[in-house]
């Protein structure tokens, strides 16, 4: 995934004993929060693997790249990064692996330049619908985000709320239409069973969509038609059995698309005929000759591209009177 990187060469560290001396005054230009490393030259602050339980209040105003990975933040409250003066330069924020289980409405407000946000590897049991939009208005101010990385944010099953995890994530993506400018969205490794049908239509600027390593069985109700800028669609390591005509036509109609379909348990029966025909003709599928049948057993391990219509049969369904128990 594309998380913010830094070319920081000279980092200054502040001594841990300063931790209790958090000033309400605006931070000095060269001040570095306790337990962090700072490089003004690289406009980068790293507070990594320090078991922080809250976002440091005294972040330097120059920060452009902020790494808060490997901490124990638990909750990201509203205005977690709101400062006076605001962190007007902050463009890349990485919060991955910081044990966040709740992100509240308006958590990223007052970050006018925030383009990249990585919340991966946090068990987000409670992601507010207004986490990214900041308000519950039907149309919010546009978010500056162009890249949102949400890989492996599914909490353990026993910690999930009594609601659809897919629905919770999608609500946050669609609230207030704030993410209309989003170009990269990564949702890998989240145990998604389905993709709510309205989600993609409302993210028209997407260039890169990663849905790999989920449990998607079908794309029947998902429309890619509006994603005219889409360049890469990662669907590897799901539970897809077949792609139907409607999906195939929509994918073929996207001018810049590359689709990744490895490691799906393709069922090579009569329903696969259209997909096989399409695969033989299309150039959009990367590594298409690696796609192999998983079922039925007699077809297992066969290369999809080498199948012909005679190979693809469905066992006849016996009328009830002929079925045996």
């Amino acid at each position: 995934s594309s998380s913010p990187t830094s070319s920081a060469s000279s980092f200054s560290s502040s001594a841990p004993f300063l931790a209790s001396a958090v000033s309400a005054q605006p931070p000095l230009p060269d001040q570095c929060p306790a337990l962090c490393e700072c490089s003004e030259a690289a406009r980068t602050v790293k507070c990594v693997n320090r078991n922080l339980t809250e976002v440091p209040t005294d972040l330097p105003a120059y920060v452009r790249n902020l790494f808060l990975t490997g901490n124990q933040l638990a909750v990201l409250p509203a205005g977690a990064f709101a400062r006076r003066p605001p962190l007007a330069e902050l463009a890349a924020l990485n919060l991955s692996g910081s044990r966040l289980d709740e992100v509240r409405a308006g958590a990223f407000e007052h970050l006018p330049s925030l383009r990249q946000l990585d919340l991966s590897h946090n068990p987000l049991a409670d992601l507010s619908p207004f986490a990214f939009s900041g308000s519950n208005a039907s149309v919010s101010a546009p978010s500056p985000l162009v890249e949102l990385i949400l890989n492996h944010i599914v909490p353990p099953e026993d910690e999930r709320q009594n609601r659809s995890f897919e629905g919770m994530v999608v609500a946050a993506l669609l609230a207030g239409r704030a993410l209309q400018g989003l170009r990269r969205l990564e949702l890998a490794s989240n145990h998604f069973l389905y993709l709510p049908r309205d989600v993609l239509a409302q993210l028209p600027s997407l260039r890169h969509l990663d849905l790999s390593n989920n449990s998607l069985v079908s794309l029947t109700y998902v429309s890619f038609r509006n994603l005219t800028h889409l360049e890469s669609l990662h669907l590897e390591d799901n539970a897809l059995k077949v792609l139907h005509n409607g999906t195939l036509a929509e994918l073929q109609g996207l001018p810049h698309i590359r689709v990744f379909l490895d490691n799906n348990p393709w069922v090579c029966d009569c329903h696969m005929a259209d997909m096989v025909t399409w695969l033989k003709e299309t150039e959009v599928v990367q590594g298409k000759d690696r796609l192999t049948c998983a079922y039925p057993e007699k077809m297992r391990n066969r290369v999809l591209l080498e199948l012909n219509s005679a190979d693809l049969d469905c066992d006849p369904i016996l009328p009830p009177s002929l079925q045996t128990s």
Epitope: N263, R290, A294, N301, R302
Partner: antibody, heavy 116, light 107 residues
Framework: QVQLQQPGTELVKPGASVKLSCKAS????????MHWVKQRPEQGLEWIGN????????NYNENFKSQATLTVDKSSSTAYMQLSSLTSEDSAVYYC?????????WGQGTTLTVSS | QVVLTQSPAIMSASPGEKVTMTCSAS?????IHWYQQRSGTSPKRWIY???KLTSGVPVRFSGSGSGTSYSLTISSMEAEDAATYYC??????????FGGGTKLEIR
């Protein structure tokens, strides 16, 4: 029935090359990827690489990229693996195996001995 | 790349005894396959997709597991079951990896 036939033994000198063969029968050769697996004496199984007989596309384990070359002859339904710059470390049994998700049929293996 | 760790490396069982061996993955995998290799012969696919027995495999064998933890069980050990068993991760793209093997001996 599906069969993958391999020569029993090959004896070569250090520094030399060898080309191992695997003749397939009982199925459509071009419809399945062919894999090669190495097993040193009393050791486990190590995947070397695979080839799509239909188009010749190959994938290699990084550890074997510079040493192994996989090819096929569609007319005789035979897969080949050439190993170059051989040392005693390459003495092992080499299996071909038909596969995709798993390896459903295996050859009997060729025992390669590298010795001067 | 997923690393598969099998345990124990060597075990022995008496005829009629129940046998369980495990395969642990370094990260979550969808399914595991098992291969049996008797001494001096090539491996045979024994169990695929975690729990499906290859045709001809005795029903005393079973496979189970999910995520990172998988196992192969023999309900009642027989002499012909003495072999080395290897697990392999479910994938159709490179690289394919195997566990180090569990050698099962008859006591």
């Amino acid at each position: 029935q599906v069969q993958l036939q391999q020569p029993g033994t090959e004896l070569v000198k250090p520094g030399a090359s060898v080309k191992l063969s695997c003749k397939a029968s009982g199925y459509t050769f071009t419809s399945y990827w062919m894999h090669w697996v190495k097993q040193r004496p009393e050791q486990g199984l190590e995947w070397i690489g695979n080839i799509n007989p239909s188009n010749g596309n190959t994938n290699y384990n990084e550890n074997f990229k510079s040493q192994a070359t996989l090819t096929v002859d569609k007319s005789s339904s035979t897969a080949y693996m050439q190993l170059s710059s051989l040392t005693s470390e390459d003495s092992a049994v080499y299996y071909c195996a038909r596969g995709g998700w798993d390896f459903d049929y295996w050859g009997q293996g060729t025992t390669l001995t590298v010795s001067s | 790349q997923v690393v598969l760790t099998q345990s124990p490396a060597i075990m022995s069982a008496s005829p009629g005894e129940k046998v369980t061996m495990t395969c642990s993955a370094s990260s979550s995998v969808r399914y595991i396959h098992w291969y049996q290799q008797r001494s001096g012969t090539s491996p045979k696919r024994w169990i695929y997709d975690t729990s499906k027995l290859t045709s001809g495999v005795p029903v005393r064998f079973s496979g189970s597991g999910s995520g990172t933890s998988y196992s192969l069980t023999i309900s009642s050990m027989e002499a012909e079951d003495a072999a080395t068993y290897y697990c392999q991760q479910w994938t159709s793209k490179p690289p394919w990896t195997f566990g180090g093997g569990t050698k099962l001996e008859i006591r």
